[in-house]
Amino acid sequence: MAVTACQGLGFVVSLIGIAGIIAATCMDQWSTQDLYNNPVTAVFNYQGLWRSCVRESSGFTECRGYFTLLGLPAMLQAVRALMIVGIVLGAIGLLVSIFALKCIRIGSMEDSAKANMTLTSGIMFIVSGLCAIAGVSVFANMLVTNFWMSTANMYTGMGGMVQTVQTRYTFGAALFVGWVAGGLTLIGGVMMCIACRGLAPEETNYKAVSYHASGHSVAYKPGGFKASTGFGSNTKNKKIYDGGARTEDEVQSYPSKHDYV
């Protein structure tokens, strides 16, 4: 039950996280104009990974796409790549984890396969989350660097009365969305990996055991036996105790004096 809950929760958390990563990637507010030096501007600037926008006080917003690929900063391209990789891995992870969910039955899929799929999706979510966090952090670092550079150059080239105030940019909402979303995807991935351990059958110290009782011979098999997935102990079949009970490998059903009346 706990395994199913952990797996389900991991899936939901990852789903929210990936939705957030997609939202952050598409958002235009990766960097927003810093209004510290000009709080009374009627024109407000903000930029995303794909286009830059200008919002006027009148309510009108005008956006322009970055129609060049080669002319863009390498860092921006790197951030784009990290976010896209994060989305792709996350999407594949979601697809895999749907089939891995314990509550969903697909044909005669064994628990070992579900455990492997859960682990795979968990790893994918972790990498996806890390990609998003890395992408957002790289962009944030770029903003901080540019912010202080433009602050240093703020009033350079002042000729006479004319001020050319350089536009500075600060963190936009998309960065916070990206960080939170990446974190959620990461947490979801960890939860999936934890759930995988619970799904993986550990080989028990006993196999199916035949009890020879007086009366009819009854083969007793412990319920809920799981096939080995390679996780957990891999102990050889051992004789646990004598006295009529033998491991399945040793059982020989010879008729004894007690078998027939």
């Epitope: 000009n38 009374v40 501007t41 009627a42 024109v43 600037n45 930029q47 830059s52 926008c53 200008v54 006027e56 006080s57 009148s58 309510g59 009108f60 005008e62 322009r64 004319v162 001020q163 050319t164 105030v165 536009t167």
Partner: antibody
């Protein structure tokens, strides 16, 4: 068609307050901002302030303490209220519609004289 | 506040001539995000309210004759009337609409000889 019409008291005593109403037609105040501009006799234009579609306002810094702009969207009316009037507030007061931060339609103006 | 300086303050010209007036702002009115200069030109004829002529420094308002041309970028702007007509007798104002308060220039008064 787009029209703006200012209506004011005409004569105001010094230290009293001024209230002017701008009634608009042909457009909605929920879609367009409205600016207030004044022009003292024989002088240039002076921007007073603006009220945006969302109701937020911006004012001329020197007049901010005694100027207030509000509106009633349902009545298509914009109100300008100015306190503590002095003789140098005597001017023609105009309201104008905003379009992408420029003023594309203007009212005919209302003359305000501050005198005892 | 941004200070708008217009020159000359008055101009007396003959009909048919080319007229040029300038407007300087104390800060750049160029928005890097959309490459627009937030400067507007108005024409005010005697006894009338101002009329929008040019916005974004160079975009002519619909219905405005093409003899009116706006140019310039950043802090220096120009309004040119290619062939002056008698009805162009007016005061011309430039206005900053980039940063609050939206300051006007003192105006250029155009008189016909």
């Amino acid at each position: 068609q787009v029209q703006l019409k200012e209506s004011g008291p005409g004569l105001v005593a010094p230290s009293q307050s001024l209230s002017i109403t701008c009634t608009v037609s042909g457009f909605s105040l929920t879609s367009y901002g409205v600016h207030w501009v004044r022009q003292p006799p024989g002088k240039g234009l002076e921007w007073l302030g603006v009220i945006w579609p969302g109701g937020n306002t911006n004012y001329e810094s020197a007049l901010m303490s005694r100027l207030s702009i509000s509106k009633d969207n349902s009545k298509s009316q914009v109100f300008l209220k100015m306190n503590s009037l002095q003789t140098d507030d005597t001017a023609m007061y105009y309201c104008a519609r905003d379009r992408r931060l420029a003023m594309d339609y203007w009212g005919q103006g209302t003359s305000v004289t501050v005198s005892s | 506040d941004i200070v708008m300086t217009q020159s000359p303050s008055s101009l007396t010209v003959t009909a048919g001539e080319k007229v040029t007036m300038t407007c300087k702002s104390s800060q750049s009115l160029l928005e890097s995000g959309n490459q627009k200069n937030y400067l507007t030109w108005y024409q005010q004829k005697p006894g009338q309210p101002p009329k929008l002529l040019i916005y974004w420094a160079s975009t002519r308002e619909s219905g405005v004759p093409d003899r009116f041309t706006g140019s310039g970028s950043g802090t220096d702007f120009t309004l040119t009337i290619s062939i002056l007509q008698a009805e162009d007798l007016a005061v011309y104002y430039c206005q900053n609409d980039y940063s609050y308060p939206f300051t006007f220039g003192s105006g250029t008064k155009l008189e016909i000889k």
